[in-house]
């Protein structure tokens, strides 16, 4: 099963329950062999994924995996939604599964809901 294809390890149907006002890092785990591909983030708007331009991104290296990180500093209520990362590798575009951010606006929440409450959304 090991190959030198680029792989993006965002899990299908994954989600993150986060709060407006907090910092958050959205990670795209990337496996590559020789040359690190160019990776971008986009946000889903219906069936279209709109590329995120001018956002703070960074790379992190861990053992045999790299992570392309989208920084939220801080999280805004408008950040709620689904995101996807894409890699440009040998002029082919490889897309990840989408991952969803559930943003709770702390101004409208009397107390922070539990993880179970968030998961039941």
């Amino acid at each position: 099963k090991e190959s030198c294809d680029v792989q993006l390890y965002i899990k299908r149907q994954s989600y993150h329950s986060i709060f407006a006002g907090d910092p958050f890092k959205l990670e795209c785990p990337v496996k590559y062999c020789a040359h690190r591909p160019q990776v971008t983030w986009c946000k889903l708007n219906g069936t279209t994924c709109v590329k995120l331009e001018g956002r703070h991104t960074s790379w992190k290296q861990e053992k045999n995996l790299s992570f392309f990180i989208l920084h939220f500093e801080p999280v805004l209520p408008s950040d709620n939604g689904s995101y996807r990362c894409s890699a440009n590798f040998l002029s082919a575009i490889i897309e990840s599964h989408s991952t969803t951010l559930y943003v709770t606006d702390v101004k409208s929440a009397s107390e922070r809901p539990s993880k179970d409450e968030m998961a039941s959304r």
Partner: antibody, heavy 121, light 112 residues
Framework: EVQLQQSVAELVRPGASVKLSCTAS????????MYWVKQRPEQGLEWIGR????????KYAPKFQGKATITADTSSNTAYLQLSSLTSEDTAIYYC??????????????WGQGTTLTVSS | DVVMTQTPLTLSVTIGQPASISCKSS???????????LNWLLQRPGQSPKRLIY???KLDSGVPDRFTGSGSGTDFTLKISRVEAEDLGVYYC?????????FGGGTKLEIK
């Protein structure tokens, strides 16, 4: 080589709780979903739920909500299934399985050998 | 929940002959990402299940090419071109498109 190690059998009294474990070797469970499946004697398979060990997020089949609690410990590469208020209906084989993701499609999955749970006084 | 209906319940086949199992879902398994998360599992006697096919037609590593998966929407088929003794066991279809994931009732393949 990926392996999932489960205890072979558990005998528990009605009304009690039990915590079944599933330890993965040859793979970091953070890159996977770990899920649990129930098989009653001479019957089919039922999906209980799953955990994303990277962040602890869980999803349960409605039938098992309140009955099952899935947790994971990434330091020991182990997933757990806790079953509460046990009755004879919970007598079954419980399989853990690991679903590993690549770019935009399921990659492969591995199943443990199953733990036979017997609820009896 | 999505109901997965498998037919037949039991299949008795002579070694070397073909076999076919049908699986119908109560709603379409085509996901919004354009993929169909329909798997086939084999549970040999006394063993844990093992996935043979995923995404309708992709063979898992080590699965012989005498196994073929096909179908779309709500109708799916697993075919074995020439049954061998090691193929006996219970076959399950399994959908991962909709929450919660659900399994078919199983088809027992017996060797005549």
């Amino acid at each position: 080589e990926v392996q999932l190690q489960q205890s072979v059998a558990e005998l528990v009294r009605p009304g009690a709780s039990v915590k079944l474990s599933c330890t993965a070797s040859g793979f970091n469970i953070k890159n996977t979903y770990m899920y649990w499946v129930k098989q009653r004697p001479e019957q089919g398979l039922e999906w209980i739920g799953r955990i994303d060990p990277a962040n602890g997020n869980t999803k349960y089949a409605p039938k098992f909500q309140g009955k099952a609690t899935i947790t994971a410990d990434t330091s020991s590469n182990t997933a757990y299934l806790q079953l509460s208020s046990l009755t004879s209906e919970d007598t079954a084989i419980y399989y853990c399985a690991l679903l590993y993701y690549g770019s935009s499609y399921d990659y492969f999955d591995y199943w443990g050998q199953g733990t036979t749970l017997t609820v009896s006084s | 929940d999505v109901v997965m209906t498998q037919t037949p319940l039991t299949l008795s086949v002579t070694i070397g002959q073909p076999a076919s199992i049908s699986c119908k879902s109560s709603q379409s398994l085509l996901d919004s990402d354009g993929k169909t998360y329909l798997n086939w599992l084999l549970q040999r006697p006394g063993q844990s299940p093992k996935r043979l096919i995923y995404l309708v037609s992709k063979l898992d590593s080590g699965v012989p090419d005498r196994f073929t998966g096909s179908g779309s929407g709500t109708d799916f088929t697993l075919k074995i071109s020439r049954v061998e003794a090691e193929d006996l066991g219970v076959y399950y279809c399994w959908q991962g498109t909709h929450f919660p994931q659900t399994f078919g009732g199983g088809t027992k393949l017996e060797i005549k």
